[in-house]
Interface confidence: low
């Protein structure tokens, strides 16, 4: 599918919160959304409110995921399931790459070779059938402020 | 076991309409993401069509889109394929197959086929 | 969409290995673990062989083998028997959520 207009990223430093984003994956065209109840998925309707992210660098190169709404941050579980937890944990944490392509990449800190992704079905996909070169894995930040 | 039965296929006339069904049996089929793949006789295989274990997203191959429609009835564990405006080009043979889990592009449980013969 | 490259025959005797190559794109082989094999033996459906590349459905013999260097996939058969004798193609996902496959590549046993 067409990329949907206004991407933009790009590192920030340490503990700086930047504005709300939509992180658009280019598997299918699905938002990244966090539920309340903490599952993680994808929807492709931009005006859910569960797609509001708040990205927070812990340090260059790694922030953390937290769904405005649902007010938890996106975790890699150690069997590869992507769920939302109340509180920040080592598990919440995920390199942020800029690729050629102009798309990130968020890989898990805890589990280094596991991606956030999303299959072309809007579910998530298992960290443990992620890679490097896959098109789930890739994400385009987009503003949320509207 | 673990089954694909196509049904539906014949003969119709360039610019006809025929509607191919697959029911599956032994497996749980509301579980699976599901496709359509043909075999002109004598040719190679081609992806026709993917719709998700839900049904809410939908592919085509460029050769289909706008003539072919692909449902699925997760209560009677079938799936279906409306072809339109049907071109000689389409006479083949069509599989349903099953995708495997957590994949893309892997079909592990196919049909047998059905006959699709467009001619005047 | 386009189809993956592969040779139109191959033949090896009973005993032996044979190598059949998929050339595609970045757009598809290239650019994603996805590639599969499938088996056809003549009049019936196919047969999932190799997935991700590399990976063997249960009940495939290990015989069978897959790999892939840029955007060239190869199938590897080893101690080839009278019952591989077939038709194989090659498959792909590729960057437009479709899969494609190439034209097979017909195996002789001598």
């Known amino acids: 599918p067409a990329l949907p207009e206004d991407g933009g990223s790009g590192a920030f430093p340490p503990g700086h919160f930047k504005d709300p984003k939509r992180l658009y994956c280019k598997n299918g065209g699905f938002f990244l959304r966090i539920h309340p109840d903490g599952r993680v998925d994808g929807v492709r309707e931009k005006s859910d409110p569960h797609i509001k992210l708040q990205l927070q660098a812990e340090e260059r190169g790694v922030v953390s995921i937290k769904g405005v709404c649902a007010n938890r941050y996106l975790a890699m579980k150690e069997d590869g399931r992507l769920l939302a937890s109340k509180c920040v944990t080592d598990e919440c944490f995920f390199f942020e790459r800029l690729e050629s392509n102009n798309y990130n990449t968020y890989r898990s800190r805890k589990y280094t070779s596991w991606y956030v992704a999303l299959k072309r079905t809007g579910q998530y996909k298992l960290g443990s059938k992620t890679g490097p070169g896959q098109k789930a894995i890739l994400f385009l930040p987009m503003s949320a402020k509207s | 076991q673990v089954q694909l039965q196509e049904s539906g296929g014949g003969l119709v006339q360039p610019g006809g309409s025929l509607r191919l069904s697959c029911a599956a049996s032994g497996f749980t089929f509301s579980s699976y993401e599901m496709n359509w793949v043909r075999q002109a006789p004598g040719k190679c295989l081609e992806w026709v069509s993917y719709?998700?274990?839900?049904?809410?997203?939908?592919y085509y191959a460029d050769s289909v889109k706008g003539r072919f429609t692909i449902s699925r009835d997760n209560a009677k564990n079938s799936l279906y394929l409306q072809m339109n405006s049907l071109r000689a080009e389409d006479t083949a043979v069509y599989y349903c197959?099953?995708?495997?889990?957590?994949?893309?592009?892997?079909?592990?449980?196919w049909g047998q086929g059905t006959m699709v013969t467009v001619s005047s | 969409q386009s189809v993956l490259t592969q040779p139109a025959s191959v033949s090896g005797s009973p005993g032996q290995s044979i190598t059949i190559s998929c050339t595609g794109t970045s757009s598809d082989v290239g650019g994603y673990n996805y590639v599969s094999w499938y088996q056809q033996h003549p009049g019936k459906a196919p047969k999932l062989m190799i997935y991700d590349v590399s990976n063997r459905p249960s009940g495939v013999s290990n015989r069978f083998s897959g790999s892939k260097s840029g955007n060239t996939a190869s199938l590897t058969i080893s101690g080839l028997q009278a019952e591989d004798e077939a038709d194989y193609y090659c498959s792909s996902y590729t960057s437009s959520s479709t899969v494609v496959f190439g034209c097979g590549t017909k195996l002789t046993v001598l």
């Open positions: 197959a099953r995708e495997l889990t957590g994949d893309w592009g892997a079909f592990d449980i």
């Open positions: 719709i998700s274990s839900s049904g809410s997203t939908i």
